[in-house]
């Protein structure tokens, strides 16, 4: 039956040759006439390669539906299927002409220098490597490498087929790199091309869906999800996918091989499913399938439909942070919503932005969190389709574990007088404010480097027992004081005193502070002597560039070979509980002063003077004496600490300010400096001298104008000066009302 | 709960035909690779035939290539076995089994053939 | 094909004591992506077959953690430890590296 015209019942076309095979020589001439009843066309080996140049088709001249194929010089090439079809139809007669070529027996494929052959290694398939034959009845092997190995037919599962080519079991071939037909024909050897083996499966190495996860669409937005199957070289791939709402008529599934790279040992296929306007009924899993026939995979993902863009907070956001100083805080922005928010954070109203501190992102995040870091932080949610906005603040408190201010925690303490009345502080900054601050003591001698004790010079006191300073049996007696609250550099601190009644015995106090967050220790060596005595000249804290003198002074009759020593920098404790290092058990670590020696009647003075002081003059003396008749050291440790200069600086501002004739002012002007500067005052750029109307009290930082009058009126500047300079602040004191007219008083005192 | 039924065994003469049906229920038939295997009565397994979750691809085991042909109806939720020029060394329990991954997790209760003149 | 062997035919076991079954491949089961294709079945009398393990020591789900596959790339390994009347049965293992799937010829594990 006619495909293209089914009304009309066509002959099939008839060919000039009535055979199946036609075989012929090589060099001669193919010409076949093909007749029908409409238009023919005809279909030759080869016919889209260049060799068309040679095939001549022509009308014949006796009559219509009539045409010739001519190929002049025929080749081994030229044999194949010669087919003449009336267009359009499935209707064809076909003839098969070998052309005999002895030198080239196989039919070359063209322009292909190599073919490919695909198998598995399954014992239950065979290949065929297509080695066509020009020649019917050829004596035709196979031959594989390597190793070298030749198969012939067998009459069973290995033939030879001239139109067909070598067919053979494919695991008998597995092992090769690749194989070739060989032809004998007079003892002559004949190869057909190399075919390159490439051993392929059935097995699906994975099935990935994309987007893999967190899937969130609102209603009538399209869903597009890719299924991939990856797998061995010649699978085969079924697709199928289970989904909510199965029977949706918006549904569109492709399925398609994905290009893989030349080389790859893998195949990709792909599936998409499509869905165009979705609705809530579709929320659920979505699963695909892939299936080679002997192995299926899937994988699932869920997809969440929204009735509409929303933006919500999640029940797990949380409004109070609390961290310790040093930790890395993160605050993530818990929400619901679709599309994903845009995300924006703000610390006291003041947006944030990333840097190498801080992360601000969904997860607010902070390296390494400081007492600075404390406030309310805003998180604010935008939806980028709706713009609809929620905010929420965090509360972040960061806590500061005890941290016990006083210098002396880093380097050897002072030695005391014996008999003295002292004080041992401790200043304590923490938040929260420490919970309690306890005292504890241990007898130096307990203490002390014994060779039967492990002693590291990080750790120089094998102290294991430290008693509770209300147990001061065998040492000092002892009082605590109650703790004091102090602004110290503006921050709250714990002050906690501990008062030797009098000194009597060497010890080492410590005092423990905790809190919540933990816990800070102090260990004071309180070293008693009998012995030298230091004192300092003047008796205050020197400044830079100022002169200071260190009076060592001691009993002739009692001690010799008295020297000035200064502590050469220790390594500082690193450990909480570290102790300071016993400084007249380690003379390794001191420097030898010069100084001057005087005496007077009962006592030896060692000076040692210090022109200019600087700051790297600080740090810890020692005076060494030698007792003349035991020949101990007894030394003694003073702490110097030199002020850095600081120019003037005044703090808080002066007011402007309107009184009445007849009230009073009250003003302080507070400076700051090292040298402590000097305050003056000006009103209206003149200096303002005491009378009685005029008070200048505290080193005249405080001012007081009693009963005012209109005079009194005007600029008033506050200027501190000191060696380094000035500063000076200045308000305007507005007089209101009516002058009073009095002769008890003409004060007034302006120069 | 995931069942498999199998159902069309019986007694068949050497070179006789007959069709093997698993009714299969309790999960998305379609969504997973269905294969037969087969019990001798010395109690071997042989896997005969397995199908791809669209039955466009199909494997034989040699012993049965060109006699038997496997099938599926997704919309019945069934697999078939059709057996042709059956013989004695045929007579065995028939399988069908679930496939994911390779592995078949579930097998029905089996249907029994016996090839015999 | 390759070619799954279970040497012992039968193998009698006392409740309550462990026991090893051993299966053994004419090629490694081992695959080029790292995994080792060898599934374990039971089949109990008058049940079809269950799986219990795959990739050689997966249990499949539902399994009791009494049982624990092991093995090479040829040999392999079903241990079971405190033997239960309900692990009576025939035990087959099975490849899956290479299409035909080939079964071993089963052990029945039967009470003394």
């Known amino acids: 039956a006619s495909v293209g015209l089914p009304s009309v019942s066509l002959d099939l076309p008839r060919l000039s040759i009535q055979k199946d095979i036609l075989t012929i020589k090589a060099n001669t001439t193919l010409q076949i006439t093909c007749r029908g009843q409409r238009d023919l066309d005809w279909l030759w080996p080869n016919n889209q390669s260049g060799s068309e140049q040679r095939v001549e088709v022509t009308e014949c001249s006796d009559g219509l539906f009539c045409k010739t194929l001519t190929i002049p010089k025929v080749i081994g090439n030229d044999t194949g299927a010669y087919k003449c079809f009336y267009r359009e139809t499935d209707l064809a007669s076909v003839i098969y002409v070998y052309v005999q070529d002895y030198r080239s027996p196989f039919i070359a494929s063209v322009s292909d220098q190599h073919g490919v052959v695909y198998i598995t290694e399954n014992k239950n398939k065979t290949v065929v490597i297509p080695c066509l034959g020009s020649i019917s009845n050829l004596n035709v092997s196979l031959c594989a490498r390597y190793p070298e190995k030749r198969f012939v037919p067998d009459g069973n599962r290995i033939s030879w087929d001239s139109k067909k080519g070598f067919t053979i079991p494919s695991y008998m071939i597995s092992y090769a790199g690749m194989v070739f037909c060989e032809a004998k024909i007079n003892d002559e050897s004949y190869q057909s091309i190399m075919y390159i083996v490439v051993v392929v499966g059935y097995r699906i190495y994975d099935v990935v869906l994309s987007p893999s996860h967190g899937i969130e669409l609102s209603v009538g937005e399209k869903l597009v999800l890719n299924c991939t199957a990856r797998t061995e070289l010649n699978v085969g791939i079924d697709f199928n996918w289970e989904y909510p709402s199965s029977k949706h008529q918006h549904k569109k599934l492709v399925n398609r091989d994905l290009k893989t790279q030349s080389g790859s040992e893998m195949k990709k296929f792909l599936s998409t499913l499509t869905i165009d306007g979705i609705t809530r009924s579709d929320q659920g899993l979505y699963t695909c399938a892939a299936s080679s026939g002997l192995m299926t995979k899937k994988n699932s993902t869920f997809v969440r439909v929204h009735e509409k863009p929303f933006v919500a907070f999640g029940s797990g956001m949380e409004s109070l942070v609390e961290a310790t100083v040093g930790e890395r805080v993160r605050i993530p922005a818990k929400y619901l919503g679709y599309p994903p928010p845009e995300i924006k954070w703000y610390k006291n109203g003041i947006p944030l932005e990333s840097n190498h501190t801080i992360k601000a992102g969904h997860v607010l995040t902070i390296m390494e969190v400081s007492e600075r870091d404390t406030g309310n932080y805003t998180v604010i949610l935008t939806n980028p389709i709706s713009k609809e906005k929620q905010s929420h603040v965090v509360s972040l408190v960061v806590y500061v574990p005890p941290q016990i201010g006083e210098k002396s925690l880093i380097s050897p303490v002072d030695s005391y007088q014996y008999g003295t009345t002292q004080t041992l502080t401790c200043t304590v900054y923490a938040i929260p404010p420490p919970h309690h601050i306890h005292w504890y003591w241990q007898l130096e001698e307990e203490c002390a480097n014994e060779p039967s004790h492990a002693v590291s010079v990080t750790n120089p006191y094998p102290c294991e027992e430290w008693r509770s300073v209300e147990d001061f049996q065998g040492g000092n007696k002892i009082e605590v004081n109650k703790n004091q609250f102090a602004l110290i550099e503006g921050k709250n601190k714990t002050v906690s005193t501990l008062v030797i009644q009098a000194a009597n015995v060497s010890a080492l106090y410590k005092c423990e502070a905790v809190n919540k967050v933990g816990r800070g220790e102090r260990v004071i060596s309180f070293h008693v002597t009998r012995g030298p005595e230091i004192t300092l000249q003047p008796d205050m804290q020197p400044t830079e560039q100022e002169s200071v003198s260190l009076w060592c002074t001691a009993d002739r009759s009692t001690f010799e070979n008295l020297t000035w020593y200064k502590l050469g920098p220790q390594p500082l404790p690193i450990h909480v509980g570290e102790l300071p290092t016993p400084v007249c058990k380690n003379l390794d670590t001191l420097w030898k002063l010069n100084a001057t020696m005087f005496s007077n009647s009962t006592n030896d003075i060692l000076i040692m003077e210090l022109k200019n002081a600087s700051l790297q003059d600080q740090g810890d003396y020692v005076c060494l004496a030698q007792d003349r008749k035991t020949k101990k050291r007894h030394c003694v440790v003073r702490q110097l600490t030199v002020l850095e200069r600081v120019a003037p600086t005044i703090t808080g501002n002066l007011e402007n300010q309107t009184t009445s004739i007849g009230e009073s002012i009250e003003v302080s002007c507070t400076a700051s400096g090292n040298p402590p500067p000097q305050i003056m005052w000006f009103k209206d750029n003149e200096t303002l001298v005491e009378d009685s109307g005029i008070v200048l009290k505290d080193g005249n930082r405080n001012l007081t104008i009693r009963r005012v009058r209109k005079e009194d009126e005007g600029l008033y500047t506050c200027q501190a000066c000191s060696v380094l300079g000035c500063a000076k602040v200045e308000a305007f004191f507005i007089i209101e009302g009516a002058q009073e007219k009095t002769n008890l008083e003409h004060h007034h005192h302006h120069h | 709960e995931v069942q498999l039924v199998e159902s069309g065994g019986g007694l068949v003469k050497p070179g006789g035909s007959l069709k093997l049906s698993c009714a299969a229920s309790?999960?998305?038939?379609?969504?997973?690779?269905m294969s037969w295997v087969r019990q001798t009565p010395g109690k071997r397994l042989e896997w005969v035939a397995s199908?791809?979750?669209?039955?466009?691809?199909?494997y034989y085991a040699d012993s049965v290539k060109g006699r038997f042909t496997i099938s599926r109806d997704n919309a019945k939720n069934t697999l078939y076995l059709q057996m042709n020029s059956l013989k004695a060394e045929d007579t065995a329990v028939y399988y069908c089994?679930?496939?994911?991954?390779?592995?078949?997790?579930?097998w029905g209760q089996g249907t029994t053939l016996t090839v015999s003149s | 094909d390759i070619v799954i062997t279970q040497d012992e035919l039968s193998l009698p076991v006392t409740f309550g004591e462990s026991v090893s079954i051993s299966c053994r491949s004419s090629?490694?089961?081992?695959?080029?992506?790292?995994?080792?294709?060898l599934n374990w079945f039971l089949q109990r009398p008058g049940q079809s077959p269950q799986l219990l393990i795959y990739?050689?020591?997966t249990r499949a789900s539902g399994v009791s953690d009494r049982f624990s596959g092991s093995g090479s790339g040829t040999d392999f390994t079903l241990k079971i430890s405190r033997v239960e009347a309900e692990d009576v049965g025939i035990y087959y293992c099975?490849?899956?590296?290479?299409?035909?799937?080939?079964f071993g010829s089963g052990t029945k594990l039967e009470i003394k």
């Open positions: 089994a679930r496939e994911l991954d390779g592995n078949y997790d579930y």
């Open positions: 309790g999960f998305t038939f379609s969504m997973y690779g």
């Open positions: 199908i791809s979750i669209g039955g466009s691809y199909t």
């Open positions: 090629k490694s089961l081992l695959y080029k992506d790292g995994k080792t294709y």
């Open positions: 990739l050689m020591s």
């Open positions: 099975q490849q899956l590296v290479e299409y035909p799937f080939t």
